[in-house]
């Protein structure tokens, strides 16, 4: 599975919340960022994440109209130079400072259920998704027999009217 271009095809600034409307927030603690899943107080400002969309060519036998075997990969950056990374060994989701080109651990295959409801599958560990576990983000294995609509891996993107992310 290879990214077909070094530049994102589009970028989207949004706030991220769980299916149950808890907000994903990011806090700088001891020079590293922590990720929290929490209820925000009324009128409390939501953290924003820059989603960068990349096209990826899936290795397949498909051919013909040039449009098959493509998938959308996203990277998620809540603040300058920091991206969400999949730590597949620890089954955790972490924020790391990275330089471009970003490592594969920073890329997630986008699955969307429309109405701005999405799931993020680890590029480095197919079948493993960003999910919510004990009020934290974690990597959760989803059996192929399960429906991807399982709520703990579903997230809502809500648009923001601010154009600057940093």
């Amino acid at each position: 599975m290879s990214i077909t271009g070094i530049s994102p095809i589009t970028e989207y600034l949004a706030s991220l919340s769980t299916y149950n409307d808890q907000s994903i927030t990011f806090a700088l603690e001891d020079e590293s960022y922590e990720i929290y899943v929490e209820d925000l107080k009324k009128d409390e400002k939501k953290d924003k994440v820059l989603l960068s969309y990349y096209e990826s060519q899936h290795p397949s036998n498909e051919s013909g109209d040039g449009v098959d075997g493509k998938m959308l990969m996203v990277t998620l950056s809540p603040t300058k130079d920091f991206w969400l990374h999949a730590n597949n060994k620890e089954h955790s989701v972490e924020l790391h400072k990275s330089e471009k080109p970003l490592p594969d651990q920073a890329f997630f295959v986008l699955h969307n259920m429309h109405s701005n409801s999405v799931s993020f599958e680890s590029k480095t560990d197919p079948g493993v998704f960003i999910g919510v576990k004990d009020n934290h983000l974690a990597l959760i294995k989803v059996d192929s027999s399960e429906n991807l609509s399982t709520e703990n891996i579903l997230f809502k993107l809500s648009e923001t009217h601010h154009h600057h992310h940093h």
């Epitope: 949004a14 899936h58 109209d65 075997g69 986008l110 699955h111 969307n112 429309h114 109405s115 648009e159």
Partner: antibody, heavy 121, light 106 residues
Framework: EVQLVETGGGLVQPGRSLKLSCVAS????????MYWIRQAPGMGLEWVSS????????YYLDSVKGRFTISRNNAENTVYLQMNSLRSEDTATYYC??????????????WGQGTLVTVSS | DIQMTQSPSVLSASVGDRVTLSCKAS??????LDWYQQKVGEAPKLLIY???NLQTGIPSRFSGSGSGTDYTLTISSLQPEDVATYFC????????FGQGTKVEIK
């Protein structure tokens, strides 16, 4: 080569039913969202219904909700549109389309040639 | 629901002209916008996706731009084979087409 072939259109009386089929080939059907879009004679395009790759999520235009049902059989590479309680305003060419990316509901990358549904007494 | 409004409804231009088609959304659609071309008697064809990405096999004279609520399809040098109706389409929230712009040769 990607192909989408729609069948099942025809002349039907108001209030009756019709089932459209779209047989897909040339791509991994089960990885893609599929859609039905219609076009009344001489008019613009109107999205009608969507189904995600595993069939677990379906969406409908408000005016067809409760009357139309989209479904898919991934083993047979086929997507269906069951149309009940048909009205004259449902008269249109119905196109089947496939999504652009695996697992994502963005863009209609490829369209079939369409099947004409005429609702008239 | 998001409404999409295209202008003009009909555009008449000469071969070689630079042609600009407009599409306006009732809400911010975050660049989640496509352009489709439909020739008489044919199925529509995807030209541009995510506002400015050219679909495989589409000539480079077609380009897209825009953000927020305002989007544009440009044909840098109109060719006889570009005679068609062009539809914009948003997929940011639900799925909605514009009413179309018919492009004719003078």
């Amino acid at each position: 080569e990607v192909q989408l072939v729609e069948t099942g259109g025809g002349l039907v009386q108001p209030g009756r039913s019709l089932k459209l089929s779209c047989v897909a080939s040339g791509f991994t059907f089960s990885n893609y969202w599929m859609y039905w879009i219609r076009q009344a004679p001489g008019m613009g395009l109107e999205w009608v219904s969507s189904i995600n790759n595993d069939g677990g999520n379906t969406y409908y235009l408000d005016s067809v909700k409760g009357r139309f049902t989209i479904s898919r059989n991934n083993a047979e590479n086929t997507v269906y549109l069951q149309m009940n309680s048909l009205r004259s305003e449902d008269t249109a060419t119905y196109y089947c389309a496939k999504g652009h990316y695996y697992y994502s509901s963005y863009s209609f990358a490829f369209w079939g040639q369409g099947t004409l549904v005429t609702v008239s007494s | 629901d998001i409404q999409m409004t295209q202008s003009p409804s009909v555009l008449s231009a000469s071969v070689g002209d630079r042609v600009t088609l407009s599409c306006k959304a009732s809400h911010n659609i975050n660049k989640h916008l496509d352009w489709y071309q439909q020739k008489v008697g044919e199925a529509p064809k995807l030209l541009i996706y995510f506002t400015n990405n050219l679909q495989t096999g589409i000539p480079s004279r077609f380009s897209g731009s825009g953000s927020g609520t305002d989007y544009t399809l440009t044909i840098s040098s109109l060719q006889p084979e570009d005679v068609a109706t062009y539809f914009c389409f948003q997929y940011n929230s639900g799925w909605t087409f514009g009413q179309g712009t018919k492009v004719e040769i003078k």
